[in-house]
């Protein structure tokens, strides 16, 4: 079942998704789509990365984290009730059926009437799994899309991995609540 995340109308929503690049420069293409992850690709793509850049995005959707270090978490600016629903983060590992797919459920709550301290990110439930990718030798083919074979180790929760990481510090500094 999907992990659930919440945000209020008018806030920025944050949908976490992570992987570890096999090697510097060998980033894995990632797509984000609205709707559950289909068999291939992402449906209703809102943002896409390639081996180095964000190469497609639609307004209000962006990557605020260190996406070149594997933090491909999606920020949705100024959400409305219409932004509620399932989002797919797909790590497009080279090879047949190697992709890692994460379905994240975004629940948008109406804005509170009483003023409250602004929070940029509001997390609920657990973080999605973190991916560790390891390369087996250099990529020698002549296309940007060709990367080394990657062996994935899934890690059930991100929390322990983040104890002293930069992301943990970022979360602390942002004042985000982890429930």
């Amino acid at each position: 079942s999907e992990v659930e995340y919440r945000a209020e109308v008018g806030q920025n929503a944050y949908l976490p998704c992570f992987y570890t690049p096999a090697a510097p420069g060998n980033l894995v293409p990632v797509c984000w789509g609205k709707g559950a992850c289909p068999v291939f690709e992402c449906g209703n793509v809102v943002l896409r990365t390639d081996e180095r850049d964000v190469n497609y995005w639609t307004s209000r959707y962006w990557l605020n984290g260190d996406f070149r270090k594997g933090d491909v978490s999606l920020t949705i600016e100024n959400v409305t009730l219409a932004d509620s629903g399932i989002y797919c983060c797909r790590i497009q590992i080279p090879g047949i059926m190697n992709d890692e797919k994460f379905n994240l459920k975004l629940v948008i709550k109406p804005a509170k009437v009483t003023p409250a301290p602004t929070r940029q990110r509001d997390f609920t439930a657990a973080f999605p799994r973190m991916l560790t990718t390891r390369g087996h030798g250099p990529a020698e083919t002549q296309t940007l899309g060709s990367l080394p074979d990657i062996n994935l180790t899934q890690i059930s929760t991100l929390a322990n991995e983040l104890r002293d990481s930069r992301l943990a510090n970022d979360l602390r500094d942002s004042g985000a609540t982890i429930r």
Partner: antibody, heavy 120, light 107 residues
């Protein structure tokens, strides 16, 4: 220490091609992207594209697509940028610049620049 | 492509002044902004990467800040050797684009 040494100045006629070289030393050539940036006289900086020497992957600025080709020779740790169908507004200093993973692909080292003059 | 609007174009300064220049991206670029210094006849030099990280060997009088669309570059106490043109650059998405530059000149 890291060095990027570019080829010498070129004078070309409109319609001709130019090929600028950039020899890298002091680091593992295949571990870093090589980008190319140009600067017209008295103007700002304009990105042409990049090549990843590890696998030859390239990405070009749409503005130059079809006119620019970037290649590398791993055996000599040299990157090349060829620009075809030259026009007078291609007159500029052309720089190679190393795109560093650890600096989020900003350019931590630059070549000294190659002046390309396009004139009839 | 993403437009980087850099202001001001010229900045008259005296030694010891604190100066600030800004760069505004036409859409969000996260923290993927770098600042470069270029002196006449020289190649650009990287000062700040990923919006706020000072590059190795860069004096701590140079600082960068910002995220999303608005970025600031500050020199806390201008030295004579800082007279140069400063460029911002986004490297979030290609084509990577630069600001038009801010030229520091003597008052």
């Amino acid at each position: 220490q890291v060095q990027l040494v570019q080829s010498g100045a070129e004078v070309k006629k409109p319609g001709a091609s130019v090929k600028v070289s950039c020899k890298a030393s002091g680091y593992t050539f295949t571990d870093y992207y090589m980008d190319w940036v140009r600067q017209a006289p008295g103007q700002g900086l304009e990105w042409l594209g990049y090549i990843y020497p590890n696998n030859g992957g390239t990405s070009y600025n749409q503005k130059f697509k079809g006119r620019v080709t970037m290649t590398t020779d791993k055996s000599t740790s040299t990157a090349y940028m060829e620009l075809r169908s030259l026009r007078s507004d291609d007159t500029a200093v052309y720089y190679c610049a190393r795109g560093g993973y650890y600096s989020y692909y900003s350019y931590d080292y630059w070549g000294q620049g190659t002046t390309v003059t396009v004139s009839s | 492509s993403i437009v980087m609007t850099q202001t001001p174009k010229f900045l008259p300064v005296s030694a010891g002044d604190r100066v600030t220049m800004t760069c505004k991206a036409s859409q969000s670029v996260g923290n993927n902004v770098a600042w470069y210094q270029q002196k006449p006849g020289q190649s650009p030099k990287l000062l700040i990467y990923y919006a706020s990280n000072r590059y190795t060997g860069v004096p701590d009088r140079f600082t960068g800040s910002g995220s999303g669309t608005d970025f600031t570059f500050t020199i806390s106490s201008v030295q004579v050797e800082d007279l140069a043109v400063y460029f911002c650059q986004q490297h979030y998405s290609s084509p990577y684009t630069f600001g038009t530059g801010t030229k520091l000149e003597i008052k």
